[in-house]
């Protein structure tokens, strides 16, 4: 008996061939021996089976002795043995229809679990193997689960169902809802305008939800909510914003926040959360602000940074075009009795400058100038 695998929702064509290359009488029946379709001369006739409105044949092939049964919009319950009767012969074809669906939704939040469920006909014992967009293979039976979805899991999952040495392939598009970056850091000189951007790693037709930015300033004992906002069809509207600092927010995606000026008291880290409509859980992006200040007080030239810096970052003070006078893995450095000239305060990581602030030291009879 020939075995054919089909996919739920697809169309399958079961073949039936006569030795005579001409149009002769044929019938397709199901395992209950109820007629699905056949011919009466050149006319296609259909029986009362449940396939009645989804079954067809190709009349153009009848003259060549081919009498296919085409079943559209396949259902799991279409799995059956189909019998083609032609020239006093019976050809049997076993059709097995499978369906593969993702749990509840194909749009999942980062960190959530993806469960793929295989619908299969009674009596079948298929095996399933799925390959994620990043090339990870998972195997299973009726259900396959992937916990802790990552951004790289977004894309087309290819799943192969194996039954009776035959296979059928499913493609499922999974969208992992996440921000492009889990964390970002912004380095700014005191007084500069700060731009925070929170680009999403996915695009959807309509995006609705609400969000909030909580901020933990380095100098503060507790965190506070800086801004809350709503998102409706990709349009952003601010609900509530603190008076200090008075953040501004862009009206369109990507989510964009502007802090009028970087001040040491704002240095710290924030957590932007976005709750999407009809989704359980929230999207998170961490954002960090490091603020630098260079000052000269009497005979002391000081450079300080505030905010979450890594212990491997180097803070240096140097006179322009000269070697660093002082260089430490600390958050403050200073030079006593600095020479006159343009001094540079540098925050660097393995030689790469992350933040730079210049201060002009005038001869001792003058006051310093900050460009």
């Amino acid at each position: 008996k020939k075995v054919v695998l089909g996919k739920k929702g697809d169309t399958v064509e079961l073949t039936c061939t006569a030795s005579q290359k001409k149009s002769i009488q044929f019938h397709w029946k199901n395992s209950n021996q109820i007629k699905i379709l056949g011919n009466q001369g050149s006319f296609l006739t259909k029986g009362p089976s449940k396939l009645n409105d989804r079954a067809d044949s190709r009349r153009s092939l009848w003259d060549q002795g081919n009498f296919p049964l085409i079943i559209k919009n396949l259902k799991i319950e279409d799995s059956d043995t189909y019998i083609c009767e032609v020239e006093d012969q019976k050809e049997e074809v076993q059709l097995l229809v499978f369906g593969l669906t993702a749990n509840s939704d194909t749009h999942l939040l980062q960190g959530q679990s993806l469960t793929l469920t295989l619908e299969s006909p009674p009596g079948s014992s298929p095996s399933v193997q799925c390959r994620s967009p990043r090339g990870k293979n998972i195997q299973g039976g009726k259900t396959l689960s992937v916990s802790q979805l990552e951004l790289q899991d977004s894309g087309t999952w290819t799943c192969t169902v194996l039954q009776n040495q035959k296979k059928v392939e499913f493609k499922i598009d999974i969208v992992v809802l996440a921000f492009q970056k889990a964390s970002s850091i912004v380095y700014k000189k005191e007084g500069e305008q700060v731009e925070f951007s929170f680009p999403l790693a996915f695009t959807v037709e309509k995006l609705t939800g609400s969000g909030e930015l909580w901020w933990q300033a380095e100098r503060a004992s507790s965190s506070k909510s800086w801004i809350t906002f709503d998102l409706k069809n990709k349009e952003v509207s601010v609900k509530r914003v603190t008076q200090d600092p008075k953040l501004q927010m862009g009206k369109k995606l990507p989510l964009h926040l502007t802090l009028p000026q970087a001040l040491p008291q704002y240095a710290g880290s924030g957590n932007l959360t976005l709750a999407l409509e009809a989704k359980t859980g929230k999207l998170h992006q961490e954002v960090n602000l490091v603020v630098m200040r260079a000052t000269q007080l009497q005979k002391n030239l000081t450079c300080e940074v505030w905010g979450p810096t890594s212990p491997k970052l180097m803070l240096s003070l140097k006179l322009e075009n000269k070697e660093a006078k002082v260089s430490k893995r600390e958050k403050a450095v200073w030079v006593l009795n600095p020479e006159a000239g343009m001094w540079q305060c540098l925050l660097s990581d393995s030689g790469q400058v992350l933040l730079e602030s210049n201060i002009k030291v005038l001869p001792t009879w003058s006051t310093p100038v900050q460009p």
Epitope: N32, Q33, I34, K35, K50
Partner: antibody, heavy 120, light 107 residues
């Protein structure tokens, strides 16, 4: 066991629409085809058409232009609408369950029938 | 549509008589034929399917035969409770169609 009960007005005016409902009790409406059959007084049976719970319908070509069938799975009911009625549509209307089993296809459960008269 | 022609339209026989009803299809319907019994004021009841298979619980005095276009329904020994109208119905193709019926009475 499964029982069927037809309901609807017994009198319909010519050119109006005949509306009947069949309520399925004692079993699920799912997985089967449900049909309507009519029988004018002293005459034979005429299959009007059938519907399943997916809403898939097949109508008798002789009535197709006037027939609409629908299903309400939440109420375990299916309905028949026959438009532009004339006196020739006066009959006993039966609802029935269509069953397929080995070598058999036919109506295995019937309602008791409801008489519809078309008259002004 | 497949036309089903039943004959006779009515007959009268004595209790114990052998009663035969014929049904002719307008085209080949293989064995896809049912026979129903309908008593006055009641819904039809299935007696025979696939031309000759007796439905469970139906007395063995009822039988059916034939294939293709010509079919026969027989009551081997008519009983008083057999007074009814008998219908053939094809299920080879949609629409399902019935014969005109044969009314059986007792003399």
């Amino acid at each position: 066991q499964v029982q069927l009960q037809e309901s609807g007005p017994g009198l319909v005016k010519p050119s109006e629409t005949l509306s009947l409902t069949c309520t399925v009790s004692g079993g699920s409406i799912s997985t089967y085809y449900w049909s309507w059959i009519r029988q004018p007084a002293g005459k034979g049976l005429e299959w009007i058409g059938r519907i399943n719970t997916s809403g898939s319908t097949t109508y008798n070509p002789s009535l197709k232009s006037r027939v609409t069938m629908s299903v309400d799975t939440s109420k375990n009911q299916f309905s028949l609408k026959l438009s532009s009625v004339t006196a020739a549509d006066t009959a006993v209307y039966y609802c029935a369950r269509e069953l397929e089993r080995y070598y058999y296809y036919g109506m295995d459960v019937w309602g008791q029938g409801t008489t519809v008269t078309v008259s002004s | 549509d497949i036309q089903m022609t039943q004959s006779p339209s009515s007959l009268s026989a004595s209790v114990g008589d052998r009663v035969t009803i014929t049904c002719q299809a307008s085209q080949d319907i293989s064995n896809y034929l049912n026979w129903y019994q309908q008593k006055p004021g009641k819904a039809p009841k299935l007696l025979i399917y696939y031309a000759s298979i007796l439905e469970t619980g139906v007395p063995s005095r009822f039988s059916g035969s034939g294939s293709g276009t010509d079919f026969t329904f027989t009551i081997s020994s008519l009983q008083p409770e057999d007074i009814a109208t008998y219908y053939c119905q094809q299920y080879d193709s949609l629409p399902l169609t019935f014969g005109g019926g044969t009314k059986v009475e007792i003399k």
